[in-house]
Interface confidence: low
């Protein structure tokens, strides 16, 4: 006869490991007992359990409640055992020794491999700002056994680099993703992908990129000069910009306070029925935590009684400064 077993048994941490040992012999042969042992290079052979055809299963106290026979129905020639709730310390070599009658004893060794699936963690880098050079966007760390694979899935252009640290029973892999921040990356997903034989599917952690920026400011509302006439209602100036974090807007008048009745509502400056007193230089001030920008426009309200006057639509210079 001969023993049917496996060279390697692979199990995920926390699962039950079936250690196979089946005696395939002649019909009249019997299995008397199966002795299971852990083979440790330092401590030698340690008894795990004894499976006796008559007396049943005896488990070493160190493995109490952890070693069982597979559920019935069981073949009398099957000496396999279940090791419940496999932990990393169970990893190693095991031996089954089968005593048969009348053929004598047979033995086989197998290796138990306990996969430790990684629990990845993603750590965002420092705040990203447009204008920075190559900057750490995020790092992703996963520790497992064997070493996990850590990669990045993203449409964003960048560079990735990995390093690993080996632990006695596992390996930690950290991958860093560096990029040159630009506003087009804002809101883009950066996904850490961790692959491991102990995972049914890749583990993915997504980080949404936030890149701080502030666009140039401009003012809309002076496109049609004929609208800026004395008596016209509903005239507005709208300040245009965009940024991350979203910017705040403020309006001032360069040559004095805002005229009576002129209302600031966020990015919009609303005028009451126009008078010549509304002529002047208006400044839109846009700011966020990163920067601030100004755009100024000159408004001249046309009096229809004075046809010689034209509306001045000059947009003056734009200014900005970094915080």
């Amino acid at each position: 006869g001969e023993l049917e077993t496996s060279d390697v048994v692979t199990v995920v941490l926390g699962q039950d490991a079936k250690l196979p040992c089946f005696y395939r012999g002649d019909p009249d042969e019997q299995v008397g007992q199966v002795a299971w042992a852990r083979v440790d290079p330092n401590e030698g052979i340690r008894e795990l359990a004894l499976l006796h055809s008559k007396y049943g299963l005896h488990v070493n106290p160190a493995y109490e409640d952890r070693v069982e026979q597979p559920p019935p129905p069981r073949d009398p020639l099957d000496g396999s055992v279940l090791l419940r709730n496999a932990v990393q310390a169970d990893e190693g070599e095991y031996e089954c020794r089968v005593s048969t009658f009348p053929a004598g004893s047979f033995q086989a060794r197998m290796r138990l491999r306990v996969l430790v699936p990684p629990l990845p963690s993603l750590n965002p880098g420092p705040p990203l700002e447009e204008g920075q050079g190559l900057t750490l966007a995020a790092s992703c760390t996963a520790e497992g056994s064997p070493a996990p694979s850590v990669t990045w899935d993203t449409e964003v252009k960048g560079t990735q680099s990995s390093r690993s640290f080996t632990h006695p029973r596992s390996a930690a892999v950290t991958s860093e993703f560096h990029l040159v921040p630009s506003r087009s990356m804002n809101g883009q997903p950066l996904t850490c992908v961790v692959s491991h034989p102990g995972l049914l599917q890749d583990r993915r952690i997504t980080h949404t990129l936030q890149v701080a920026f502030l666009a140039e400011a401009s003012v809309r509302g002076l496109e049609d000069q004929n609208l800026w006439q004395v008596g016209r209602e509903g005239a507005t100036l709208k300040c245009l910009s965009e940024g991350q974090p979203p910017p705040k807007y403020n309006w001032t008048r360069l040559d004095g306070p805002l005229p009576s009745g002129v209302r600031v509502k966020g990015d919009t400056l609303g005028f009451p029925p126009l008078t010549t007193e509304h002529s002047g230089v208006y400044v839109c001030h846009v700011s966020n935590e990163l920067s601030s920008r100004d755009s100024q426009v000159t408004v001249e309200v046309l009096d229809p009684e004075d046809p010689g006057k034209q509306v001045d639509l000059v947009s003056a210079s734009h200014h900005h400064h970094h915080h």
């Epitope: 750490l136 790092s139 760390t141 680099s161 390093r163 690993s164 080996t166 632990h167 950290t174």
Partner: antibody
């Protein structure tokens, strides 16, 4: 500014245990983002990494010393310590503690203690 | 473990001249390589990390290059305070290792 300071006996008897402590000032060990390492340098020779520890207690040792070395951390005192057992004259060296900013750059030992000389002799 | 071999063991150069130090790894360490300067009685000081990035406060006369297994530290114009022992160090895989050092001395 983070500073590291080694302390411990400068003389240890053969077969005894070398014990050193590194006190971190100017920053908290438990803030994360750093490993804390021990490195040694025998007189007139090069540098050898002994091992590193994270504030959570996870340790990584040089296999050549692993059977004799223990590194542990005391976050309440902002210290981490080294124990090296069964020492011989070959363990005579300047012992440095150092900070390893990992995983973020510079991810190499960027801050070092000034070192403490330990002689193994009877 | 990864073995780092530095050459030459001793390099004699005159102040103001250029010095080129080499470090070779027994297997690829990607760009996980640092350079340190050590003066007598002092702790090592980080000069370069990531093979080519200068550490904080390091003068721009120090530059690093290389990737994989071959790395170079270049000091463009030697100042009197640059004469010391230089070590390379790989931190790509455990155990972390150092090179044997290159002693840079005044010619």
């Amino acid at each position: 500014q983070v500073q590291l300071q080694e302390s411990g006996p400068g003389l240890v008897k053969p077969s005894g245990t070398l014990s050193l402590t590194c006190t971190v000032s100017g920053g908290s060990i438990s803030s994360g983002g750093y490993y804390w390492a021990w490195i040694r340098q025998p007189p007139g020779k090069g540098l050898e990494w002994i091992g590193s520890i994270y504030y959570t207690g996870s340790t990584y040792y040089n296999p050549s010393l692993k059977s004799r070395v223990t590194i542990y951390v005391d976050t309440s005192k902002n210290q981490f310590s080294l124990k090296l057992s069964s020492v011989t004259a070959a363990d005579t060296a300047v012992y440095y503690c150092a900070r390893d900013p990992f995983p973020e750059p510079p991810d190499a030992f960027d801050i070092w203690g000034q070192g403490t000389m330990v002689t193994v002799s009877s | 473990e990864i073995v780092l071999t530095q050459s030459p063991a001793t390099l004699s150069v005159s102040p103001g001249e250029r010095a080129t130090l080499s470090c070779r790894a027994s297997q690829s360490v990607s760009s996980n390589l640092a350079w340190y300067q050590q003066k007598p009685g002092q702790a090592p000081r980080l000069l370069i990390y990531g093979a080519s990035s200068r550490a904080t406060g390091i003068p721009d006369r120090f530059s690093g290059s290389g990737s994989g297994t071959d790395f170079t530290l270049t000091i463009s114009r030697l100042e009197p305070e640059d004469f010391a022992v230089y070590y390379c160090h790989q931190y790509g895989s455990s155990p972390l290792t150092f090179g044997g050092g290159t002693k840079l001395e005044i010619k």
